[in-house]
Interface confidence: medium
C-alpha cells in the first residue's frame, strides 16, 4: 500500500496557511485541481479548486482559500488566508482526471489552528499576519462533485522525520490518528 | 549535524556536459528539497531549480529549462545536477543548498554545500 | 519575477559601527519569505535571516531583520571583524526565488 505521510503546520489564528502541492508537469499542467478537507472515515470534501482546463499563474479564490497553478514549475500554490480553529484538520491536494479516479498529490498537510496572538510579522515561517491582498483577477471555479472513495483515510504505522532550525516549527509525521474536523465555513 | 558536501573542480569545453553531485548527511533526506545556486566570477547568486528528494519532482529555472536536469540518489542521500550544452557564460561557483520542508511555499537555503567551480573554455 | 535591489552596493564602516543594509522588492513580499545570507570570499553563503526577521541557528544577536511589503533592513548593531563580507537578501514567495545584488560590507 501506498504509505501516506503527513506534514503538519501549527498556526495561530489570523494567520496565513501557503504551501505547494509540486505534480507531474507533462501529464498534470492543465488538469483541474482540487484543494480538499478529509475527515475521519468520511470521502474527501473539495473546498476550491481550480478552473478546468486550469490556467497559469491564474489565482481562484473561493472564500478564504486561494489556489494558484504555476504549470511552468509544476506546482499548485495553495493558500488559507485568516485561519480560524475550525480550520484545524487533515487536507489534501487532488487532480480530477475523468473519467478516472482523482490522482492524489502528497503530502498531505494536518493543520492546527490554535487562538491567540498571532505575533510580530516574520515571527512564523508559516504564516503571514494577513497581508495578501487578495488579487483583483482571483475567479471562482465550480468543482466537480464527485471524489473517491479510495481515498477514505486510514492509518499507517507512526513514524517520525527530523526536523532542525530554521524549520524547526514544521513537524513531518506520519499520519496517526485522523481527528474529527468541524466543517469548513 | 546537517552537511552537503559536492564534488570537485570540473574544466569543461563549450558544448560538453557537467554533472555534479552533493552529497547530504545529518538529516532525513526525503524530508526536504535539493536546490541549485550559481554564482559567477564576481557577480551575485542565480537560483537554478529545485528537486524534492521525497518524489523526485523537478522545478527548473526558466532560463535553464532544457539544459538543466536535477536527479536524487535516495540510496546515498545525494543530489545531482547535471547542464549540457555548456557556454562560456556557464563558468561559476554551483552551490547545492537544502531547502525547507517538501510542502512549504517558499524556499530559502540551509545548509550550502562548499561550491563547486565549473569551468568553461576552449 | 521579483526583483530585489540593495543598497548600498557598498558600505565601508569600522569594527564597532552600525551597519544597515537595505533590500527593496519590485512588488510586495510577504515578511514570512524574506532572507538574508552572508558571504565571505572563497566560502559558500550561509542563512542569518529567515521570514524577515527569526535568526537562522547559530546567528548572533547583533544581526536582525525588519521590514514589510517592498521594504527590508538587516542591522549589524555592532561590527565585529569576522562580520566584513557580502550580504544578499532573497525572497521565497513568487517563482523563481531570486536575490538582490548584494551588498559589500567593508572595513573603513
Known amino acids: 500500500a501506498t504509505k501516506l505521510t503527513e506534514e503538519k503546520y501549527e498556526l495561530k489564528e489570523g494567520q496565513t496557511l501557503d504551501v505547494k502541492c509540486d505534480y507531474t508537469l507533462e501529464k498534470f499542467a492543465s488538469s483541474q485541481k482540487a484543494w480538499q478537507i478529509i475527515r475521519d472515515g468520511e470521502m474527501p470534501k473539495t473546498l476550491a479548486c481550480t478552473e478546468r482546463p486550469s490556467k497559469n499563474s491564474h489565482p481562484v479564490q473561493v472564500g478564504r482559500i486561494i489556489l494558484e497553478d504555476y504549470h511552468d514549475h509544476g506546482l499548485l500554490r495553495v493558500r488559507m488566508v485568516n485561519l480560524q480553529v475550525e480550520d484545524s484538520g487533515l487536507y489534501q491536494c487532488v487532480i480530477y482526471q475523468p473519467p478516472k479516479e482523482p490522482h492524489m498529490l502528497f503530502d498531505r498537510i494536518r493543520l492546527v489552528v490554535t487562538k491567540g496572538f498571532s505575533g510580530t510579522p516574520g515571527s512564523n515561517e508559516n504564516s503571514t499576519q494577513n497581508v495578501y491582498k487578495i488579487p483583483p483577477t482571483t475567479t471562482k471555479a465550480l468543482c466537480p462533485l464527485y471524489t473517491s472513495p479510495r481515498t477514505v483515510t486510514q492509518a499507517p504505522p507512526k513514524s517520525t522525520a527530523d526536523v532542525s532550525t530554521p524549520d524547526s516549527e514544521i513537524n513531518l509525521t506520519n499520519v496517526t490518528d485522523i481527528i474529527r474536523v468541524p466543517v469548513f465555513n | 549535524q546537517v552537511q552537503l558536501v559536492q564534488s570537485g573542480a570540473e574544466v569543461k569545453k563549450p558544448g560538453a556536459s557537467v554533472k555534479v553531485s552533493c552529497k547530504a548527511s545529518g538529516y532525513t533526506f526525503t524530508s526536504y528539497g535539493i536546490h541549485w545556486v550559481r554564482q559567477a566570477p564576481g557577480q551575485g547568486l542565480e537560483w537554478m531549480g529545485w528537486?524534492?528528494?521525497?518524489?523526485?519532482?523537478?522545478n527548473y529555472a526558466q532560463k535553464l529549462q532544457g539544459r538543466v536536469t536535477m536527479t536524487t540518489d535516495t540510496s546515498t542521500s545525494t543530489a545531482y545536477m547535471e547542464l549540457r550544452s555548456l557556454r562560456s557564460d556557464d563558468t561559476a561557483v554551483y552551490y547545492c543548498?537544502?531547502?525547507?520542508?517538501?510542502?512549504?511555499?517558499?524556499?530559502?537555503?540551509?545548509?550550502w554545500g562548499q561550491g563547486t567551480t565549473v569551468t568553461v573554455s576552449s | 519575477e521579483i526583483v530585489l535591489t540593495q543598497s548600498p552596493g557598498t558600505l565601508s564602516l569600522s569594527p564597532g559601527e552600525r551597519a544597515t543594509l537595505s533590500c527593496r522588492a519590485s512588488q510586495s513580499v510577504s515578511s514570512s519569505f524574506l532572507a538574508w545570507y552572508q558571504q565571505k570570499p572563497g566560502q559558500a553563503p550561509r542563512l542569518l535571516i529567515y521570514g524577515a526577521s527569526s535568526r537562522a541557528t547559530g546567528i548572533p544577536d547583533r544581526f536582525s531583520g525588519s521590514g514589510s511589503g517592498t521594504d527590508f533592513t538587516l542591522t549589524i548593531s555592532r561590527l565585529e571583524p569576522e562580520d566584513f563580507a557580502v550580504y544578499y537578501c532573497q525572497q521565497a514567495v513568487s517563482l523563481p526565488w531570486t536575490f538582490g545584488g548584494g551588498t559589500k560590507v567593508e572595513i573603513k
Open positions: 543548498a537544502r531547502g525547507r520542508p517538501s510542502s512549504s511555499w517558499g524556499n530559502w537555503f540551509d545548509p
Open positions: 528537486i524534492s528528494a521525497y518524489n523526485g519532482n523537478t
